[in-house]
């Protein structure tokens, strides 16, 4: 806390300008009117205040707006944003995407701080859902943002937002998140034709069920091995050798290099060796000829 002291004669600030960097902390407290500061917040960023001086300016704003800053002030906080605590930010009502962008810019290049996480949470909750423009903005600043959300939070993502998602935005998503995002992507891209559709849906296929992989295998999509390796093991296991061959097209040869890794390894174990031999890749580990295969999962479903 800065002690309350009278402003020395002639030092009362008429506007926010560079002369204030020579003020001591107590002089800033005494001589800068909080209302003036609020109306001229856009100037603060251009002035090289010390961290201690920024603390004083924040204190003045806190006193002026005990219930939380108005958006007109928030939009121009600049580096003062770094002084805010998550508790401060929870009092805000940020509705403008421009305000969000301005504050994210301040933190650019750094990990997502608790302040930024709180700001984003407030913004998204205020909007009611994660719309396309917001998602576009957030993934531009934080490519891993989407994968930081819980499956429950992802469920409120409207399909139109999926158009903003780039393949790298999904790199850190786990299967539970892709399970939620994949149906959204299917909805979003449903008006596209075969080849265009596959290009767009490819990044989300880690959430695809067996039925969809079977349907895709009929479309001559030529899935690459990197995509195939990201598919859900439980979705790949029921695929026949012929279906995998159709799904991968010319990339089927890559199975040999991946035969010890999931899901390829587990899939091989489920196939008849005779069927695997038809690929001519030397894949080993299939069910020997003459053995009976009991699908217990199917039996459970029927009982």
């Amino acid at each position: 806390e800065v002690e309350k002291t009278a402003c020395p004669s002639g030092k009362k600030a008429r506007e926010i300008d560079e002369s204030l960097i020579f003020y001591k902390k107590w002089e800033l407290e005494a001589c800068v009117d909080a209302a003036l500061l609020a109306t001229q917040m856009d100037r603060v960023n251009a002035i090289p205040f010390t961290y201690e001086q920024l603390d004083v300016l924040k204190h003045k704003l806190d006193e002026l707006y005990p219930q939380g800053y108005p958006e007109s002030v928030i939009q121009h906080l600049g580096y003062l944003f770094l002084k805010m605590s998550p508790e401060d930010i929870r009092k805000w009502n940020v509705t403008s995407l421009e305000t969000l962008k301005a504050l994210l810019e301040v933190n650019k290049g750094h990990e997502m701080s608790p302040q930024v996480a709180t700001l984003i949470d407030r913004f998204v909750k205020g909007r009611g859902q994660l719309d396309k423009d917001t998602l576009d903005t957030l993934t531009a600043f934080y490519p891993g943002y989407l994968c930081s959300l819980s499956p429950e939070e992802l469920s409120s993502v409207p399909p139109s937002s999926i158009w903003a998602v780039r393949p790298q935005d999904l790199d850190t998503c786990d299967p539970r998140q892709l399970d939620v995002l994949y149906p959204k992507a299917r909805l979003a891209f449903q008006n596209m034709n075969g080849s265009e559709y596959f290009v767009k849906i490819q990044s989300f296929l880690g959430g695809a069920p067996t039925e969809d992989l079977k349907a895709l295998s009929q479309q001559n999509v030529s899935m690459d091995l990197a995509t195939f390796m990201k598919l859900r093991t439980d979705a790949v296991l029921p695929l026949t050798v012929a279906e995998v061959q159709k799904l991968l097209g010319p990339h089927v040869e890559g199975l040999k290099a991946e035969e010890r890794h999931r899901p390829v390894r587990d899939w091989i174990l489920r196939q008849r060796q005779d069927d695997l031999d038809t690929l001519g890749l030397g894949l080993q580990g299939g069910i020997p000829n003459g053995y009976l295969v009991l699908d217990l999962s199917m039996q459970e479903a029927l009982s």
Epitope: P151, L154, S155, P158, P159, S160, R176, D179, V180, L181, Y182, P183, K184, R186, L187, F189, Q190, N191, M192, Y197, I201, P209, E211, D212, A215, L216, Q218, Q219, A301, L302
Partner: antibody
Framework: EVQLVQSGAEVKKPGASVKVSCKAS????????VHWVRQAPGQGLEWMGI????????TYAQKFQGRVTMTRDTSTSTVYMELSSLRSEDTAVYYC???????????????WGQGTLVTVSS | SYELTQPPSVSVSPGQTASITCSGD??????ASWYQQKPGQSPVLVIY???RRPSGIPERFSGSNSGNTATLTISGTQAMDEADYYC?????????FGTGTKVTVL
């Protein structure tokens, strides 16, 4: 033949909630997307939302956002649609419909329930 | 919000061809579906993805979609085809149904 069997008619007071169920008979596998569509008396069809086969992903029409919740019990092959804060304008027949037609990017509704009349009246 | 407009009614003589239009901004860039609904019954899908017929739907039902208009054609119309017909398409985050057309077989 595959059928979707819906719960019976409901009469509700304004402000209350209603939960309509839709059970698949003749096919116990939870492999299809399920839509909910409503039709007010003498009016056209209005889409409310969709739930995916595993029940983890839902998409709701903007108009119903915050008021509708769709859930799925895969053990009983039943889908539920709950609508809260009911008003008189919500009086309608509510249909569930499945997308079973073949197609990798297709959600056409080709199997429909018989409909559930929900009347909202004080 | 996206809108699909249909004529309120279309009349056709038995054995003749009925054409029902559905207009919407750049509708040809989207896939259109068509549903038939008879009084007191649930809707029935008759056309999906512009021109594909589900199994069990008679060949006399066909569809097309280009520009701003999708069209459902019923050739050799029968008395049993008398019903309301709704077009439908996906736009942005919702399925939009057309305003509906009552087909009367004279």
């Amino acid at each position: 033949e595959v059928q979707l069997v819906q719960s019976g008619a409901e009469v509700k007071k304004p402000g209350a909630s209603v939960k309509v169920s839709c059970k698949a008979s003749g096919d116990t596998f939870n492999r299809y997307y399920v839509h909910w569509v409503r039709q007010a008396p003498g009016q056209g069809l209005e889409w409310m939302g969709i739930i995916n086969p595993s029940g983890v992903s839902t998409t709701y029409a903007q108009k119903f956002q915050g008021r509708v919740t769709m859930t799925r019990d895969t053990s009983t092959s039943t889908v539920y649609m709950e609508l809260s804060s009911l008003r008189s304008e919500d009086t309608a027949v509510y249909y569930c419909a499945e997308s079973r037609v073949p197609g990798y990017n297709n959600f056409a509704m080709d199997v429909w329930g018989q409909g559930t009349l929900v009347t909202v009246s004080s | 919000s996206y809108e699909l407009t249909q004529p309120p009614s279309v009349s056709v003589s038995p054995g003749q061809t009925a054409s029902i239009t559905c207009s919407g901004d750049k509708l040809g860039d989207k896939y259109a579906s068509w549903y038939q609904q008879k009084p007191g019954q649930s809707p029935v899908l008759v056309i999906y993805q512009d021109n594909r017929r589900p199994s069990g739907i008679p060949e006399r039902f066909s569809g097309s979609n280009s520009g701003n208009t999708a069209t459902l054609t019923i050739s050799g119309t029968q008395a049993m085809d008398e019903a309301d017909y709704y077009c439908q398409a996906w736009d942005s985050d919702t399925y939009v149904f057309g305003t509906g057309t009552k087909v009367t077989v004279l």
